[in-house]
């Protein structure tokens, strides 16, 4: 009878182990393991009839196909062999033990116990069938093992051979070198490569295999497992395969594909090739006068470009336009794409114009092309030249008027300041005992006119201010308060404001400048109890045009000290110029200013304590802060009055020559102006430099409206 | 002609808020102040603050300063005035006016738990 | 803040007669930069909101009867009606727009 067993290890016995068994007896066992493993046979005890060759008694291990091992006797001899030590392994998962004994024994035998177990197959050392082992790398687990590959590669569906993806190679250079994959190492089994080599229409492939030519073939039938196919437009060409490269091919189209085929098996080492595209020849370009073309070659065919460029100081021009360089291209049909143009030397074309400034022509009839030079100047005595530089500009190669400092950059005309055009007289005579300035004495002098509509009688009220640049206007921060209360600072909005520039008699206005405000500026800590921080600017809405009765002051440099005791400034305005007049007698001369022509007087610095002391003196609560210096006589006599306010007190300065704002009519009294011992008091502009310049955006020609020591 | 136009009578519990306002017409409203006055009987007129609605910017009598918040909406040329914390000391007649020219219709303000 | 001071705080006079009203204030209202007096006279008839009479001190608002003049300067102003009118039945109050805004007492028009 037969016994199929189907467990990974078990025991065999002879029939009545471990009596003797019985006589005319026949049992197999079928032992069958998982795929993957092998079954190992051994014998604990053996003992069976001896015969010549086992023809009695015997155990045949066995698979489907082969007989393993037949054993007899006890032990071995020339004509039989026991197991003794030996060890049976199937070599597959399958393993017959086939026990037979004969029909007689002549004394007892005890039969056999054997013992097998499932043991894993190691495939990978034990697989030499190039179909069956893994292309790359195996690796074996029990029961079973897999393939797998290296970098770049990928397994096969047939999970064994590997294979690389590369069917998106396209090639669109005109020059080239294409591979079979990993050349000249053997090529990738079970692989399908597509290689596309793509050109612009006109140009036609040429192919060249190189020396190595290696690819699986056979003897009789052409190209079975491995090739080389190409198709050029309706042709296809190939396969080849074998040792022997094909000769040159001239496709005679600018589109090639390229098939390149690996069966599952093989080491071939594949294949190389050079393309290359040819196309219709041109012919040589001329050269143009005062040009170059680069590169310069023997011949020129489709698709090759070349760059026609002028010498130094010249440009190419191609239908009336200029440029650097220009490029021309090999057509299909054998032709350049473009005429060859001509090198047109370099025109800088009309200089721009300078604002407030002149160009002059160096170069005779006013020439403007390559190395011809102008100069520009800034209009004087007005404006000057930013960095103080010569102004000479040179036409350069590139056709662009270049400055050896500047550059490419135009000049720039900074407003001259504290420069009148009429000098102020040395002596004045006893606004307050002053007298009527000339036009032009005070150029910087601007009249403020503010009309605050947004409350209900409109009000109306002038001051004075001081141009510091063509946009801005320095005045006091109380000129631009509105008036209705007293205890509080609200800006009047920029609308109710307008500036006059250039102003000498009020009654005659048509010869002044007058301009709107963009932006009215209070000192942010202005303080209406005490009038600290009494400053503030006007941007003007365009900038102002500057001539001899319309000029800027200086700024003074930043220091502290502010102007030194007893040195003389000036002063204007357009405030009370009559010592008898009260403020109470002149109210009913209703808004206009309270002088017609424009007033100055000449003022000396008073020592801080001293106006300080005056002050403090008062019944009032004055309060003279370092921020404020005083002006005036102790006699009194002179001085600035009601409507003079933030008008500049103006100092020389000596090493410039310049007129520096130092000052800003502030306040004064209570009594009249021009009182003995009441000096005026002026904001201390040294103070807010720094401030000024953050509002008005610090300049590049800083120093240009700023007197520095 | 101009005209200030007065939201209606309000009776508002202690501690609560309200908001008046004060419909500008025949002007441009965003350019000219509009000033707020509060009338108790026998205790005359009293200056609360004003606003430009143009720019926002605003003035307040320091005693009311708290009490009283000035907005206005240039689109629809109002201006409102908010009285929070509300007592019985704020019962009163409450006027707009133009600067110091136009006065409002008023807006009567009785505070009662 | 500057006080206001109205007097008298009432009068009655007869239709026809002439009416002078006092308003002082505690400091000046003269504002040197604008020549202006910062003073207005308002009317405030019963339920009724106040109207504009005089601004800057003396200036007639527009509308307004020539029998209503304002005089003053500094400190001291004065309201005078010519010929009181029956429709002139009225409390009369002065502000001061100098500063931050106040107003006299007012001063109560009867008539006989």
């Known amino acids: 009878h037969t016994v199929e067993l189907n467990n990974m290890f078990g025991q065999i016995q002879s029939p009545g182990y471990p009596d003797s068994y019985p006589s005319d007896s026949e049992v197999t066992w079928n032992i069958t393991v998982p795929e993957g493993f092998r079954i190992k046979l051994y014998f604990m005890h053996f003992n069976l009839e001896s015969s010549y060759l086992c023809e009695y008694d015997y155990v045949k291990v066995e698979t489907e196909e082969q007989v393993l091992a037949t054993f007899c006797g006890r032990e071995t001899t020339d004509t039989e062999q026991t197991p003794g030590q030996e060890v049976v392994f199937s070599p597959g998962s399958f393993m017959s033990i086939t026990f037979r004994s004969d029909f007689s024994n002549e004394e007892r035998f005890t039969g056999f116990d054997a013992h097998y177990m499932a043991v894993d197959v190691d495939e990978c050392t034990e697989r030499e069938d190039e179909e069956l082992s893994c292309d790359h790398y195996c690796h074996n687990y029990i029961g079973g093992y897999y393939c797998s590959c290296r970098f770049g590669y990928l397994l096969h569906t047939d999970n064994r051979t590997c294979r690389v993806e590369c069917s998106d190679n396209v090639y669109t250079q005109r020059t080239g070198v294409i591979t079979s994959p990993d050349f000249p190492n053997p090529y990738p089994k079970s692989s399908e490569c597509f290689y596309t080599i793509e050109l612009e229409e006109g140009f036609m492939v040429s192919l060249q295999f190189e020396d190595i030519f290696d690819i699986e073939d056979h003897p009789e039938v052409p190209c079975p497992y491995d090739y080389i196919k190409i198709k050029a437009g309706p042709k296809v060409l190939g396969p080849f395969c074998g040792e022997k490269a094909p000769e040159p091919i001239n496709t005679e189209s600018h589109s090639v594909q390229i098939l390149f085929r690996s069966d599952n098996s093989g080491e071939n080492q594949g294949w190389r090739l050079s393309y290359r595209a040819t196309g219709n020849e041109c012919p040589d370009p001329e050269l143009p006068v005062h040009g170059k073309i680069e590169p310069l070659q023997a011949t020129y065919s489709f698709k090759d470009q070349v760059l026609i460029s002028c010498d130094t100081g010249y440009k190419v021009l191609k239908d009336n336009v200029e440029m650097d360089t220009f490029q021309i291209e090999c057509l299909k049909d054998g032709t350049w794409s473009n005429r060859i143009p001509t090198c047109k030397i370099a025109d800088c074309g009309a200089p721009a114009e300078l604002k407030h400034g002149l160009i002059t022509f160096s170069t005779r009839n006013n020439l403007t092309t390559y190395k011809s030079e102008i100069q520009y100047s800034c209009q004087q005595p007005y404006y000057k030249m930013l960095h103080n530089i010569t102004g000479v500009y040179t036409c350069s190669a590139q056709g662009v008027w270049m400055n050896e400092v500047l550059g490419r950059s135009q000049p720039t005309c900074l407003p001259v300041c504290g420069q009148p055009s009429r000098s102020l007289p040395n002596l004045v005579k006893r606004i307050i005992g002053g007298r009527n300035a000339e036009p032009g004495l005070f150029p910087w002098q601007a009249l403020i006119v503010v009309e605050d509509t947004s409350r209900v009688p409109n009000d109306k009220w002038f001051g004075s201010g001081a141009l510091l640049s063509e946009s801005w206007i320095l005045t006091a921060a109380h000129v631009l308060r509105s008036q209705r209360r007293d205890n509080t600072v609200t800006p009047v909005s920029k609308e109710h404001v307008t500036v006059y520039l250039g102003l000498h008699d009020v009654r005659d206005k048509s010869g002044a400048v007058n301009s709107s405000a963009a932006q009215v500026v209070l000192h942010p800590d202005f303080n209406i109890q005490n009038y600290n921080h009494d400053i503030a600017l006007v941007q003007l809405r365009e900038p102002v045009p500057l001539g001899p009765h319309v000029m800027p002051i200086c700024l003074p440099s930043p220091e502290p000290e502010g102007p030194e005791p007893h040195m003389l400034g000036l002063v204007a305005g357009w405030g009370i110029s009559n010592p008898n007049v009260t403020v109470d007698e002149i109210i009913s001369s209703g808004t206009r200013t309270l002088s017609d022509v424009l007033q100055y007087v000449k003022l000396p610095v008073v020592p801080y304590a001293e106006c300080k002391t005056s002050y403090e003196s008062r019944s009032g609560n004055y309060s003279v802060t370092e921020n404020m210096f005083c002006a005036g006589y102790y006699e009194g006599g002179k001085d600035t009055c009601l409507g003079d306010s933030g008008g500049a007190f103006v100092i020389l300065d000596d090493l410039s020559q310049r007129w520096v704002a130092q000052g800003l009519v502030s306040w004064g009294g209570p009594e009249e102006c021009g009182s003995k011992q009441v000096y005026g008091v002026y904001t201390k502009v040294s103070n807010y430099v720094d401030w000024l310049w953050e509002q008005m955006g610090s300049p590049q020609g800083l120093g240009d409206l700023q007197v520095e020591r | 002609q101009v005209q200030l136009k007065q939201s209606g009578a309000e009776l508002m519990k202690p501690g609560a808020s309200v908001k008046l306002s004060c419909k500008a017409t025949?002007?441009?409203?965003?350019?000219?102040?509009i000033e707020w006055v509060k009338q108790r009987p026998g205790h005359g007129l009293e200056w609360i603050g004003e606003?430009?609605?143009?720019?926002?910017?605003?003035n307040y009598n320091e005693k009311f300063k708290g009490k009283a918040t000035f907005t206005a909406d240039s689109s629809s040329n109002t201006a409102y005035m908010q009285l929070s914390s509300l007592t019985t000391e704020d019962s009163a007649m409450y006027y707009c006016?133009?600067?110091?020219?136009?006065w409002g219709t008023g807006t009567t303000v009785t505070v009662s738990s | 803040d500057i006080v206001m001071t109205q007097s008298p705080s009432s009068l009655a006079v007869s239709a026809g007669e002439k009416v002078t009203m006092s308003c002082k204030s505690s400091?000046?209202?003269?504002?040197?930069?604008?020549?202006?007096?910062?003073l207005a006279w308002y009317q405030q008839k019963p339920g009724q909101s106040p109207k504009l009479l005089i601004y800057?001190?003396?200036t007639r608002e527009s509308g307004v009867p020539d029998r209503f003049t304002g005089s003053g300067s500094g400190t001291d102003f004065t309201l005078t009606i010519s010929s009181v009118q029956a429709e002139d039945l009225a409390v009369y109050y002065c502000?001061?727009?100098?500063?931050?805004?106040?107003f006299g007492g007012g001063t109560k028009l009867e008539i006989k």
């Open positions: 006016l133009r600067s110091e020219d136009v």
């Open positions: 025949g002007y441009t409203f965003t350019g000219k102040w």
């Open positions: 606003i430009l609605p143009g720019t926002g910017s605003t």
């Open positions: 400091q000046s209202l003269l504002n040197s930069r604008t020549r202006k007096n910062y």
């Open positions: 800057w001190a003396s």
């Open positions: 502000k001061q727009s100098y500063n931050i805004p106040t």
